[in-house]
């Protein structure tokens, strides 16, 4: 969690002199409670916005907006503490709006915004706005909290942000899978414009189980420049068990910007639908009734199972 590297953070508006300060998330009013405290924020809204750094990088940010209740407590409002908690790491970042002048009732409802908390793709946050001073221990709470879920890099606007592009979001491999004769599966995908290796992972399941009955991994060497944007083909020899027919194929790139943490693309091939007219296969063909002897099974075999090569369209 961090703040966008903006010039100066601004919270002043007509009729209010205000400054934004870093906060320890522990306002002084918690330690030294006050008798008179303001009511809680109203209509807290959090939206996904996008902002550029001074270097020109684009980041997703949490746009936080709230209004004040129209009651006399604004006479005692000295500012606000904005807190963002990242759920999975329990990291918290706070800033404080410090009001340098007294608020007055005016013809419009007071509205505040802040758009400088940088958020990560596919993460969940709890955003809290606390009016200051905070209430005495048994006082009514004067904060409002909302959860905020940031979309992952598949999201159209997220795709072009710096963190997503760094993990390979602009690459569209357009994976196709073709079932061949003799228990083979051909996977084809488009290479990206970087000389980087790829891994194609095949995991097979039975139609009814969700644990793997077969898996194999193929390496594709880094393509040369003239091969960029061309199609690469990988052929897998499948498990000899007919029931091991539900295939999950993943293509994993190793781009320099994300190494072994790049976005993977996956396709699923369901088991073929067996029509009623088809003569049923012997049960033993679907369910192994014995443990295969060592060396006689395709089960969990990571050996080379066919060819792996680039195929170019000129």
């Amino acid at each position: 969690l961090r703040l966008l590297d903006h010039r100066a953070l601004v919270c002043s508006q007509p009729g209010l002199n205000c400054t934004v300060k870093n906060s320890t998330c522990l306002d002084d009013s918690w330690i030294h409670p006050r008798n008179l405290t303001p009511s809680s924020p109203k209509d807290l809204q959090i939206q996904l916005h996008f902002a550029h750094t001074q270097q020109g990088d684009l980041f997703p940010v949490a746009h936080i907006e709230w209004t004040l209740q129209t009651d006399a407590s604004i006479l005692y409002l000295e500012g606000a503490e904005l807190s963002v908690l990242q759920l999975n790491t329990n990291e918290r970042l706070c800033v404080r709006f410090e009001f340098l002048s007294k608020l007055r009732h005016h013809h419009r409802r007071w509205r505040f915004t802040f758009s400088h908390f940088v958020v990560d793709p596919d993460q969940e946050y709890e955003v809290t706005v606390h009016h200051l001073p905070k209430p005495i221990p048994d006082g009514d709470p004067n904060h409002q909290s909302k959860n905020f879920l940031v979309p992952d890099c598949e999201h159209a606007r997220m795709k072009v942000t710096t963190p997503c592009m760094s993990s390979g979001s602009l690459w569209d491999p357009n994976i196709t899978v073709e079932t061949l004769e003799a228990h083979q599966l051909r996977v084809s995908f488009t290479l990206w414009n970087e000389s980087t290796p790829y891994q194609v992972l095949l995991e097979s399941f039975s139609d009814s189980e969700n644990h793997s009955c077969f898996d194999v991994v193929k390496q594709i060497f880094a393509p040369r420049q003239e091969e960029f944007h061309q199609r690469a083909n990988v052929t897998f020899t499948l498990s000899k068990f007919h029931w091991c027919c539900h295939h999950h194929v993943q293509v994993q790139p190793f781009f320099s910007s994300c190494l072994n943490d790049c976005l993977r693309h996956a396709v699923t091939v369901p088991c073929p639908v067996i029509s009623n007219t088809t003569v049923p296969k012997p049960v033993a063909d679907y369910i192994p009734l014995w443990e295969p002897r060592s060396g006689s099974s395709d089960y969990k075999d990571d050996d080379d199972k066919g060819s792996s090569h680039h195929h170019h369209h000129h």
């Epitope: 790491t89 329990n90 709890e126």
Partner: antibody, heavy 118, light 107 residues
Framework: EVQLVESGGGSVQPGGSLRLSCAAS????????MNWVRQAPGKGLEWVSI????????HYADSVKGRFTISRDNAKNSLYLQMNSLRDEDTAVYYC???????????WGQGTTVTVSS | DIQMTQSPSSLSASVGDRVTITCRAS??????LAWYQQKPGKFPELLIY???TLQSGVPSRFSGSGSGTDFTLTISSLQPEDVATYYC?????????FGPGTKVDIK
């Protein structure tokens, strides 16, 4: 000293209910999300639920969704797990755990045992 | 949901041996991975977080590595007090699933 102490475990029949509590001390409870994790006899750890510091985010494991309810009272430094429609497979030691800033769970209670049996 | 697998499920090694436990996520989880040690009858203790950061107070013979889908916990020189079950846990997004565990004992 940072401490978590669970209570409320016991024996109950299938279909019954129990409410577990976790009392926190030695840290600013209201600043932390909190978790429940369980461990069936002789089995591995299973994450059950999480609640954010201000209760605006709550998640459950699929195995307990719709039956368990996590809640907290920051004024009392307490975390709760209301367990309804209990099943045999809910028999376990239940731990409350505090997440570490940066990830993982660095503070655990000693656990409270829940036995579901007819 | 993302599945976590660990291998081996159990291992026996001699005091002083280098021990390696692997944890695999079915999809990429960046470095959002923690390792725990649980001794019989005790609660789990955090060893490593963020895939490779050693928790304070944990002996330096423990180390973690990996990112994306493949992670490793290494004990550089196994000690008698390291007899325990070791669990990995992913925390990129809820549910924060644990691996099935690896039981380590002394030969």
């Amino acid at each position: 000293e940072v401490q978590l102490v669970e209570s409320g475990g016991g024996s109950v029949q299938p279909g019954g209910s129990l409410r577990l509590s976790c009392a926190a001390s030695g840290f600013t409870f209201s600043s932390y999300s909190m978790n429940w994790v369980r461990q069936a006899p002789g089995k591995g750890l299973e994450w059950v639920s999480i609640i954010s510091s201000r209760s605006s985010i709550i998640h459950y494991a699929d195995s307990v969704k719709g039956r368990f309810t996590i809640s907290r009272d920051n004024a009392k430094n307490s975390l709760y797990l209301q367990m309804n429609s209990l099943r045999d497979e809910d028999t376990a030691v239940y731990y409350c755990a505090r997440p570490k800033v940066g990830g993982g769970m660095d503070v655990w209670g000693q656990g409270t045992t829940v036995t579901v049996s007819s | 949901d993302i599945q976590m697998t660990q291998s081996p499920s159990s291992l026996s090694a001699s005091v002083g041996d280098r021990v390696t436990i692997t944890c695999r996520a079915s999809q990429g989880i960046s470095n959002y991975l923690a390792w725990y040690q649980q001794k019989p009858g005790k609660f789990p203790e955090l060893l490593i977080y963020a895939a490779s950061t050693l928790q304070s107070g944990v002996p330096s013979r423990f180390s973690g590595s990996g990112s994306g889908t493949d992670f490793t916990l290494t004990i550089s020189s196994l000690q008698p007090e390291d007899v325990a079950t070791y669990y990995c846990q992913k925390y990129n997004r809820a549910p924060f699933t644990f691996g099935p565990g690896t039981k380590v004992d002394i030969k």
